[in-house]
């Protein structure tokens, strides 16, 4: 399966939207920085069959969608930007799902690496726990926004490697 060029453009647009979402100066939030333990190894893309890599990317985007779909999120971010953000994430989920369907039967390996999916879910659980502990403060959301932007940048690298594998 070829991930369409539109997918890569959507990823870039997602990052641009997230960059615009800031409501307060991040300079005031340094002390709120937190180690979420981003699962870098899950995005290195070396140990994966293509279908498994796609399923990990899908999980990350789905979890991001869930994170920013909460009422606490809606109360924090600009509604227009959030709507654009959802649209881009939805586009990426659709692209990845279409790709996953095409991979059915192409590879002998399972379509999903369950351990990797669980690792990504636990990563997002840590983010959610941090937001809860910080009572969804503006700085906590800024830290999370920065973390998600970083994880999207790193996942874009995996997508690029997948495209080069074609």
């Amino acid at each position: 399966c070829d991930l369409p060029q539109t997918h890569s453009l959507s990823n870039r647009r997602t990052l641009m939207i997230m960059a615009q979402m800031g409501r307060i100066s991040p300079f005031s939030c340094l002390k709120d920085r937190h180690d979420f333990g981003f699962p870098q190894e899950e995005f290195d893309g070396n140990q994966f069959q293509k279908a498994q890599a796609i399923s990990v990317l899908h999980e990350m985007i789905q979890q991001t969608f869930n994170l920013f779909s909460t009422k606490d999120s809606s109360a924090t971010w600009d509604e227009t930007l959030l709507d654009k953000f959802y649209t881009e994430l939805y586009q990426q989920l659709n692209d990845l799902e279409a790709c996953m369907m095409q991979e059915v039967g192409v590879e002998d390996t399972p379509l999903m690496n369950v351990d990797s999916i669980l690792t990504v879910r636990k990563y997002f659980q840590r983010i959610t726990l941090y937001l809860t502990e910080k009572k969804y403060s503006p700085c906590a959301w800024e830290v999370v926004r920065a973390e998600i932007m970083r994880s999207f940048s790193l996942s874009a690298n995996l997508q690029e490697r997948l495209r080069r594998k074609e």
Partner: antibody, heavy 121, light 107 residues
Framework: EVQLVQSGAEVKKPGESLKISCKGS????????IGWVRQMPGKGLEWMGI????????AYSPSFQGQVTISADKSISTAYLQWSSLKASDTAMYYC??????????????WGQGTLVTVSS | DIQMTQSPSSLSASVGDRVTITCRAS??????LNWYQQKPGKAPKLLIY???SLQSGVPSRFSGSGSGTDFTLTISSLQPEDFATYYC?????????FGQGTKVEIK
Amino acid sequence: EVQLVQSGAEVKKPGESLKISCKGSGYSFTSYWIGWVRQMPGKGLEWMGIIDPSDSDTAYSPSFQGQVTISADKSISTAYLQWSSLKASDTAMYYCARHPGLNWAPDFDYWGQGTLVTVSS
Amino acid sequence: DIQMTQSPSSLSASVGDRVTITCRASQSIDDFLNWYQQKPGKAPKLLIYFASSLQSGVPSRFSGSGSGTDFTLTISSLQPEDFATYYCQQSHTLPLTFGQGTKVEIK
């Protein structure tokens, strides 16, 4: 390879203006902040201010607020430090360094080579 | 502003010595403390970040400890290339502030 390359040494007269630069390469320039640090001859390090190149948001040390201006041009991955009217006391080595912003990563992990500014009549 | 106070301001030591430099913050900075090494005519180099994390490529003889207000940089066995000036820096709150430096000289 990550690099921060600063503009060359400058010799200026009091009252003159100056703009020095710091060009980033080998990484996503807008994903990191750029900080500026002063070191006067034989003295320690003083943090001057910082910029987020993604939106040019800046913050200054109270000691340098109003004395210098920090800016950035993300299209050419370059940050700037400028003075509108130099004083002899601005004579120092100026360093730029990258900062990970709100991400959990090492602070000021890469530094420019420094720009020596000499202000003398 | 958070004041950072280093001690001693200078020390003389021999190759192979264990060297300890301390840094005290005027208020709690959790573990948002970095250590840098600077040699004459060179830019500072990050050694330790978040109080105790060793920066990539830095020899393991360097270690950092502490949290809150009191921090320590330890060089377990001083090497010839370690003679330099060392700075601590807090990254808890703007303005970021450095200690005044500790010069490690050859005895």
